[in-house]
């Protein structure tokens, strides 16, 4: 019997054991977070699966993920949202220490999908473990990209108070309008709920003492945010290692000077 023809995409295929991984992560998350103990992980998986299974993987829409978003609805207290762009690891290290602040990946849906890839095939109930669409080479409306766009939009929409964003000062574009932060989250912060956006620009080099808050791309971010009637603040984090250390031990004498 000849194998059925399968669409070849440019990106890597679905992460192995994807259903088991999502289900296991969901169970673990709901065990650790008492406010999410009511979540039925089988229902969450069913809704996740329903978003992409049997659908052409270059024609996925935000609508497809709304049932999953509905089941994973979670609120972050005001002043506790941390966005990030091109500096995921440090952002996650920070929220692991500062437990009352939350990145998207600290929320159920972000936690479920973090670092995973998935896609299905049109008109079959199969998951494609061989290849999935690449955002650049194949299409932007693929299951993974649309998922992150959908949950990022929702995360930004529900933020309130002072919102923080961690930006990578080592990149040529510290603020990139094409990043998820620049293209989705910035535009979905609600001015009636968000008083201010505070950017933390993380320096890379040890001897880098420049004020990266004066960078043209940061000025561009300030302009976008100000036009949306949200105040903007910026801080340089010259020593990220010391910054994390001081979050862990704020009483340390060396933490009284600048970081």
């Amino acid at each position: 019997v000849l194998p059925r023809w399968r669409q070849q995409w440019s990106g890597s295929g679905t992460t192995s054991r994807f259903p088991e991984t999502v289900l296991a992560r969901c169970v673990k998350y709901t065990e650790v977070h008492p406010e999410m103990r009511h979540v039925d992980c089988q229902s969450v998986w069913d809704a996740f699966k329903g978003a992409f299974i049997s659908k052409y993987p270059c024609n996925i829409t935000e609508e497809d993920y709304q049932p999953l978003v509905k089941l994973g609805t979670q609120t972050v207290p005001c002043n506790k949202t941390l966005l990030w762009s091109r500096i995921k690891d440090l952002a996650h290290q920070f929220t692991q220490v500062q437990r009352d602040m939350f990145t998207l990946e600290d929320m159920l849906l972000g936690y479920l999908a973090d670092d995973l890839t998935w896609c299905g095939e049109f008109n079959t109930f199969e998951i494609n473990y061989q290849s999935c669409p690449d955002w650049r080479k194949d299409c932007s409306n693929n299951p993974v990209s649309v998922f992150w766009k959908t949950v990022s939009r929702r995360f930004a929409e529900t933020a309130c108070g002072v919102v923080h964003v961690m930006l990578n000062g080592s990149r040529s574009k510290i603020f990139d309008k094409n990043s998820t932060f620049g293209s989705v989250e910035v535009h979905n912060l609600q001015p009636e709920k968000v008083q201010a956006l505070e950017a933390w620009v993380i320096h890379g080099g040890r001897e880098d003492s420049r004020d990266l808050c004066q960078d043209p791309t940061i000025k561009e971010l300030e302009s976008i945010i100000s036009k949306r009637n949200i105040r903007f603040f910026c801080k340089n984090i010259y020593r990220p290692d010391k910054f994390l250390q001081c979050v862990k031990n704020p009483e340390d004498s060396s933490c009284l000077s600048g970081i």
């Epitope: 229902s43 809704a47 709304q66 509905k70 089941l71």
Partner: antibody
């Protein structure tokens, strides 16, 4: 044939209670989200409540939150709406509806059951 | 007050094409469905997932969605199309919401 059949509608006094039932047949009831939708006399459709396929999640319109409870018995293929603290403004025809793939639309509707709240 | 806005009435003569519109911010990121309610009967699904027709619905009924508005078009209008038409979607809280309904009169 795919069918939904509501029952339990009645005339009840303000502050009273009523339990509506909706029997399902012709489809795998336990695979689908279900909704209750109502229509006051001469008015439009108003969504009342939703329940997930396994019954573990429920959602309510603000107008009924805390007073109405949606539930289901998948072994009996039956959807319920327990209505407490009834008010005159709850007077309506109540429909149960099957949700097609969560949010595609409500593809099967019952014929409706009439609830009248009046003293 | 519905977050989906529909004109209260529309009319057309037999054979004509009529369009019923529905607008609301939640339409942007949620599927829209359309329902026909003939006098004294339960609603019937006409369109699901923005523009798809369930089997049995004549192809005279079509729909589209763009941004925060959606529309239902009925071509070759017939007397039996006289009914109330409702759009529905999920709102920003991801709960169902219906438009106020449009009463279609066939002149």
């Amino acid at each position: 044939e795919v069918q939904l059949l509501e029952s339990g509608g009645d005339l009840v006094q303000p502050g009273g209670s009523l339990r509506l039932s909706c029997g399902a047949s012709g489809f795998t009831f336990s695979d689908h989200y279900m909704s209750w939708v109502r229509q006051a006399p001469g008015k439009g459709l108003e969504w009342v409540a939703d329940i997930s396929a396994r019954g573990s999640n429920t959602w309510y319109a603000d107008s009924v939150k805390g007073r109405f409870t949606i539930s289901r018995d998948n072994s009996e293929n039956t959807l319920y709406l327990q209505m407490n603290s009834l008010r005159a403004e709850d007077t309506a025809v109540y429909y149960c509806a099957k949700n097609w793939n969560y949010n595609y639309g409500m593809d099967v509707w019952g014929h409706g059951t009439t609830v009248t709240v009046s003293s | 007050q519905s977050v989906l806005t529909q004109a209260p009435s529309a009319s057309g003569t037999p054979g004509q094409r009529v369009t019923i519109s529905c607008s609301g911010s939640s339409i942007q990121n949620n599927y829209v469905s359309w329902y026909q309610q003939l006098p004294g009967t339960a609603p019937k699904l006409l369109i699901y997932r923005n523009f798809e027709r369930p089997s049995g619905v004549p192809d005279r009924f079509s729909a589209s969605k763009s941004g925060t508005s959606a529309s239902l078009a009925i071509s070759g209008l017939q007397s039996e199309d006289e009914a109330d038409y409702y759009c529905a979607s999920w709102d920003d809280s991801l709960n169902w919401v219906f438009g106020g309904g449009t009463k279609l009169t066939v002149l």
